[in-house]
């Protein structure tokens, strides 16, 4: 009779991360009688998978009954596979011996490969805000993914973007990897409402790329443009200027009337109206009783907007002439106001 | 295909440096360790130790304690064999040789191996 | 260290002969072996692993057998391109450790 051959049928296995692994194993015949051992490699630092004979093994589970007489097949199933468990395990036959049972054939070994979902993407932006025309960067990261082979893109507002830099940790053969990019992306005024999209690809992922987001909001500043007009009111002696806030994302915006450089009142944007492309609009105003002054005065609006150095506009009110309007505003404007009598 | 390429041979004083390369292309250098085995010259082979590619940790045989020492530049997929203070003993062929495992964690036998370098230690 | 002794230094042969090369280790490695073949100037070349597993693209004129301590590489049918060094190899334990080597010639 010809010798025991130990047949594993597959040189490679994979396997999703999660799931579980059967390694096929047949013995060509029952003789010499003698249990069989799983390893995980070979060399002095191979590590035993499964004993038929002896020991506690709660993630494998043998293919056929190995109680039987008969039986030829040494097929085991090991469960819940993480990418750990790569490497080429090897089926050996162990012949009855005493004291102790002697190693007599292994198989050719199968090599085990584990796929593993990415993680989702994580996007981060810059820590502190940028303005329209700056460059900022995002970085977006993904972990615990295999095999290597991976696909990263970005996008703002669905249009792809070209700027960016990708590496995959570690460089050689891991378990798993991670993923790591940086992406530059220009500021323009309209991006309160833009968002920054990180897509990756995988094998694991059977063309549903996972996604990674972030909110331009949450990165742009846009500045405000100031405009100061006076109109006449109903009493000839008192003037109305108006400070209009225009186009400033986000919301934190405090103001200060200034006349010949004393303040005369700060107050805070609360009630704000909302421009389509998510910036915002305020106005505020100033009812000065040019009757009490003597000389011209200058009014100055001064907006410092989320916590950046000051800007200002100011206007000059001449007292000797009868004013002029100057500019037209609607009420639904006036979502501020200040009155200020001057004697 | 999978290739060990070995830097070429070297003709040292005793009490010298010698760093020889094994430059390793066609497969995934950190996935599988590598060894170091002697030849002195009409004698027989002599494992030296490994490196693990992936970790960078290093085993040497107890014979080769001390004065020999293995090194990585993954990036240019490269194992590197350095020998200090030679002596005329050193004089002899040295193979890189590839393990047969992914990830394994212990050489075991070698299915690839560099062409060698001899490595000549004379005054 | 387990010694592996290869007691035959060199063994002359003829072409289409059938060839024995023993391998004796100084403690059991199981079948822990793998055979190499060098030729002169060369690099060695891996035949057998697992003491009876023939590595890929390696004629099937090669057949290893053994286990414990006893272990032979066998050529059945002789060939010219045969001539050569074959030395057992065992990775039991460390250090790893190679036989001396036995040297095929044509008598």
């Known amino acids: 009779e010809e010798e025991l051959q130990v047949i594993q049928p597959d040189k490679s296995v994979l396997v999703a991360a999660g799931e579980t692994a059967t390694l096929r194993c047949t013995a060509t015949s029952l003789i010499p009688v003698g249990p069989i051992q799983w390893f995980r490699g070979a060399g002095p630092g191979r590590e035993l998978i499964y004993n038929q004979k002896e020991g506690h093994f709660p993630r494998v589970t043998t293919v056929s009954d190995l109680t039987k007489r008969n039986n030829m097949d040494f097929s085991i199933r090991i469960g819940n596979i993480t990418p750990a468990d790569a490497g080429t395990y090897y089926c050996v036959k162990f012949r009855k011996g005493s004291p102790d049972d002697v190693e007599f054939k292994s198989g050719a070994g199968t090599e085990l490969s584990v796929r593993a979902k990415p993680s989702a993407p994580v996007v981060s932006g810059p820590a502190a805000r940028a303005t329209p025309q700056h460059t900022v960067s995002f970085t977006c990261e993904s972990h615990g993914f295999s095999p290597r082979d991976i696909t990263l893109k970005w996008f703002k507002n669905g249009n792809e973007l070209s700027d960016f830099q990708t590496n995959v940790d570690p460089v050689g053969e891991s378990v798993s990897y991670s993923i790591h990019s940086t992406a530059k992306v220009v500021l323009t005024r309209e991006d309160v409402h833009s968002q920054v999209i990180c897509e990756v690809a995988h094998v694991t992922l059977q063309g549903d790329p996972l996604r990674g987001t972030a909110n331009l909001s949450e990165t742009i500043r846009v500045p405000p443009t100031l405009e100061v007009t006076q109109q006449p009111v109903r009493a000839e002696n008192q003037v109305n200027v108006t400070c209009q806030v225009r186009k400033f994302y986000p919301q934190r915006l405090q103001l200060t009337w200034l006349e010949n450089g004393n303040v005369s009142r700060t107050e805070t944007a609360s009630t704000v109206t909302e421009n389509k492309d998510g910036t915002y609009n305020w106005m505020s105003w100033l009812l000065v009783n040019v009757s009490a002054h003597r000389d011209d005065v200058k009014l100055t609006c001064q907006v410092e907007h989320d916590g950046q150095p000051a800007v200002s506009k100011s206007h000059d009110l001449k007292v000797s002439a009868h004013p002029k309007e100057q500019g037209s505003n609607t009420a639904a404007e006036n979502t501020g106001s200040n009155e200020r009598n001057i004697y | 295909q999978i290739q060990l390429v070995q830097s070429g041979p070297e003709l040292k004083k005793p009490g010298e440096t010698v760093k020889i390369s094994c430059r390793a292309s066609?497969?995934?250098?950190?996935?599988?360790?590598m060894s170091w085995v002697k030849q002195a010259p009409g004698k027989g082979l002599r494992w030296m130790g490994w490196?693990?590619?992936?970790?960078?940790?290093?085993t040497c045989a107890d014979d080769f304690k001390g004065r020999f020492a293995f090194s990585l530049e993954t990036s240019a997929t490269t194992a590197y064999l350095q020998i200090h203070n030679l002596t005329n003993e050193d004089t002899a062929t040295y193979f890189c040789?590839?393990?047969?495992?992914?990830?394994?964690?212990?050489?075991?036998?070698?299915?690839?191996w560099g062409q060698g370098t001899l490595v000549t230690v004379s005054a | 260290d387990i010694v592996m002794t290869q007691s035959q230094k060199f063994m002359s042969t003829t072409i289409r002969d059938r060839v024995s090369i023993t391998c004796k280790a100084s403690?059991?490695?199981?079948?822990?072996v793998a055979w190499y073949q060098q030729k002169s100037g060369q690099s060695p070349k891996l035949l057998i692993y697992?003491?009876?597993n023939r590595y890929t693209g390696v004629p099937d004129r090669f057949t290893g057998s053994g286990s414990g301590t006893d272990f032979t590489l066998t050529i059945s049918n002789m060939q010219s391109e045969d001539l050569a060094d074959y030395f057992c190899?065992?990775?039991?334990?460390?250090?790893?450790?190679f036989g001396s080597g036995t040297k095929l010639a044509i008598k």
């Open positions: 040789a590839r393990d047969p495992h992914s990830y394994g964690n212990s050489p075991a036998w070698f299915p690839y």
């Open positions: 066609g497969y995934t250098f950190t996935t599988y360790g």
């Open positions: 490196i693990n590619t992936y970790s960078g940790v290093s």
């Open positions: 403690q059991n490695v199981g079948i822990s």
């Open positions: 697992s003491a009876s």
């Open positions: 190899q065992q990775y039991s334990s460390y250090p790893l450790t």
